[in-house]
């Protein structure tokens, strides 16, 4: 019986040819959706010129079709027993799914403007910058597209430097027809309990953003965990889209198209400031802004961004500092719609169903030598936009999950 | 090999107008900041001001900002400082130093020409 | 504006000796400090720029360290042809100033 079970359970986990789990690990049989909402700013003239509060409406959502695209340069290594990938990127914007359409215009922070005179602090080069900006009639907010927001466009203050500048900006950019990785993961062959843990990113076990143990690349990359999954667990996984790994928690039993899950989150501890979660100490990398690292909720990941200021941090600042948030008007976070989750039968520890919810925010700071910036009292973490990336097992896997694994065992 | 050839030494009575030049060649000379130095006999160096080519954007000392004048000329590859209203205390040995622009961090004044001796003299 | 105050003035040395000169800045610069040598009749000439960076062909018995504002500038083993004037620079802010200078001499 149970042992039967287990037993081809473990046969159907491994990551090599002719497996159920390897079929769909290729190219996921679920539909994932990534739906955007872009924090349009109410009052940019008054935040220029008086250091006012950020006045934000969000607008979306905005939907796209993501991870439609097959893995790449599948390759397996039978001498350590991993398989190496890329994961294409693609996105295929969804109008019945959206409120609007990708020509949509909002108002949002001028991304070469702030990350420029971030990366950029000695006076001379800010003087320099300033006659660029004021020449290009650039200023501190501007008018994108969605899709200029999104996938990039032609910066006039940026094409007014000359090589070695990228003038190209987007949240983004580039990202249609660019892959993830090389990701190198573990098919489980010789050992079950390493199947689809990360054995190496980019050729590195470290990523070499962070200090001591916050800079390792721990578990999977949370499509998948190993098999026979048990409540007490904390499920490590790689995320490269914030520049870490975290961890999510049990958080209770679901009923999912009649297959029993659990439901796993990323608990506020995770994002907790070092006075309140020691083991956080070396996502803390600068004094200033983090409030000698008494903030919390947000991650500044400009190290993996090539010095541009960008923050990661939940939708609406959920779990953040009220110091964080304060500067923002418009924000109502709630756990419900802001957190992220995993549905994980234990069984298989495959991941039928989650929600990756976060939020893309640019520091802004108060610059003597740009015009632009020079009216700032403060620095200001500015929501750009949150995103809401989500996958549920279509009804016909989830019958044939149902006949061959849970109705099996039940 | 990165070369800034300056003009000449300059004898000019108070009151009078001067304008030196600075002649670059060995690299793309709208790709780096052209800064200029003042050093009194006998004194300390001072920095007067600087100009990036690509643009013509120019960041002044105050001190200089009604004496010296900043200006290049592309196509000849060529940084000028014109003084004006020149005094006893203009006397001096005034140098042109360029820097490639691209990133914090970077050195400062890393090319010198050779310098320009200016004297004030009735 | 941000003042450099550099000391000695001058001093004398005999030849393997080491010589340390002190830049010290009215305002918080970080490590954008730069120092310079001037030889009698030539241009000065740039040793160690920002973040205590040795420039290429520079000998490495050149160093300098400090942070914030109290910057050290060290020769170790002193030769005949490091007589010259020293500056130091700091690129933090504008206007960019220098340190009044040190007479290097060999007894």
């Known amino acids: 019986g149970d042992l039967l079970i287990q037993k081809t359970i473990k046969k159907q986990v491994v990551l090599e040819e002719g497996t159920i789990a390897f079929k769909n690990w290729v190219k996921t049989g679920t539909e994932v959706y990534r739906q955007f909402w872009i924090f349009d700013v109410q009052n940019p003239q008054e935040v220029m010129m008086n250091s006012s509060n950020i006045q934000v409406k969000q607008r979306g959502p905005y939907t796209y079709r993501v991870r439609f695209l097959a893995k790449e340069n599948v390759t397996q290594d039978a001498e350590d027993n991993t398989v190496s990938f890329l994961q294409p990127n693609g996105a295929i914007f969804e109008p019945s799914l959206s409120v609007g359409t990708e020509a949509d215009n909002f108002t949002v922070l001028n991304l070469a403007v702030a990350a420029a005179s971030h990366i950029y602090q000695n006076q001379f080069v800010q003087m320099i910058l300033n006659s660029l900006i004021n020449k290009s009639k650039s200023s501190m907010f501007q008018v994108r597209t969605l899709r200029e927001l999104l996938w990039g466009y032609r910066d006039p203050f940026l094409s007014l430097v000359p090589y070695p500048v990228t003038t190209t900006v987007g949240l983004f950019y580039p990202y249609n027809n660019t892959a993830d990785g090389v990701y190198k993961v573990f098919n489980g062959k010789d050992n079950i309990s390493k199947v689809a843990i990360i054995d190496t990113y980019k050729g590195k076990r470290n990523l070499s953003y962070w200090e001591s143990h916050c800079d390792m690349i721990n578990g999977t990359d949370a499509a998948s965990f190993p098999p026979f999954v048990e409540k007490s667990q904390v499920l490590q996984f790689f995320s490269s889209d914030i520049c870490r790994s975290i961890y999510a928690v049990f958080e209770s039993d679901v009923n999912l198209k009649g297959i029993p899950v659990y439901r796993f989150v990323l608990p506020s501890k995770a994002f907790a400031s070092p006075v309140e979660n020691p083991d956080n100490y070396c996502f803390c990398t600068e004094k200033i802004i983090s409030k000698n690292c008494t903030s919390y909720g947000v991650l500044d990941i400009s190290k993996c961004k090539e010095g541009r200021p960008v923050y990661i941090s939940l939708p609406h600042f959920l779990y953040a500092s009220p110091d964080v948030s304060e500067p923002i008007d418009g924000l109502n976070p709630n756990e419900e719609e802001h957190r992220t989750y995993l549905d994980i039968e234990p069984i298989t520890g495959f991941t039928l169903q989650f929600a990756k919810r976060l939020q893309v925010n640019l520091l802004v700071k108060p610059s003597e030598k740009i015009q632009v910036l020079k009216n700032l009292k403060r620095n200001y973490i500015v929501p750009i936009l949150w995103l809401n990336e989500t996958g549920t097992i279509g009804d016909e896997k989830a019958n044939m999950f149902r006949s061959q694994v849970t109705g099996k065992i039940n | 090999e990165v070369q800034l050839q300056q003009s000449g030494p300059e004898l000019v009575k108070p009151g009078a107008s001067v304008k030196i030049s600075c002649k670059t060649s060995?690299?793309?000379?709208?790709?780096?900041?052209m800064h200029w130095v003042k050093q009194s006999h006998g004194k300390s160096l001072e920095w007067i001001g600087g100009?990036?080519?690509?643009?013509?954007?120019?960041a002044y000392n105050q001190k200089f900002k009604n004496k010296a004048t900043l200006t290049v000329d592309i196509s000849s590859n060529t940084a000028y400082m014109a003084l004006r209203s020149l005094a006893s205390d203009d006397s001096a040995v005034y140098y042109c130093?360029?820097?490639?622009?691209?990133?914090?961090?970077?050195?400062?004044?890393?090319?010198w020409g050779q310098g320009t001796l200016v004297t004030v003299s009735a | 504006e941000t003042t450099v105050t550099q000391s000695p003035a001058s001093l004398s040395v005999a030849t393997g000796e080491k010589v340390t000169i002190r830049c010290i800045t009215s305002?918080?610069?970080?490590?954008?400090m730069n120092w310079y040598q001037q030889r009698p009749g030539e241009p000065p000439n740039l040793l160690i720029s920002?973040?205590?960076t040795l420039r290429p062909g520079v000998p490495s018995r050149f160093s300098s360290s400090g942070y914030g504002t109290d910057f050290v500038f060290t020769i170790e083993n002193t030769l005949s042809e490091d007589v010259a004037d020293y500056y130091c620079?700091?690129?933090?802010?504008?206007?960019?100033?220098f340190g009044s200078g040190t007479r290097l001499e060999i007894k």
């Open positions: 130093a360029s820097d490639y622009f691209y990133g914090d961090g970077y050195p400062w004044f890393t090319y």
């Open positions: 060995g690299y793309t000379f709208t790709e780096y900041t």
């Open positions: 100009i990036y080519p690509y643009n013509g954007g120019t």
């Open positions: 305002t918080d610069i970080d490590d954008d």
């Open positions: 920002e973040g205590n």
């Open positions: 620079l700091q690129s933090d802010n504008l206007p960019f100033t």
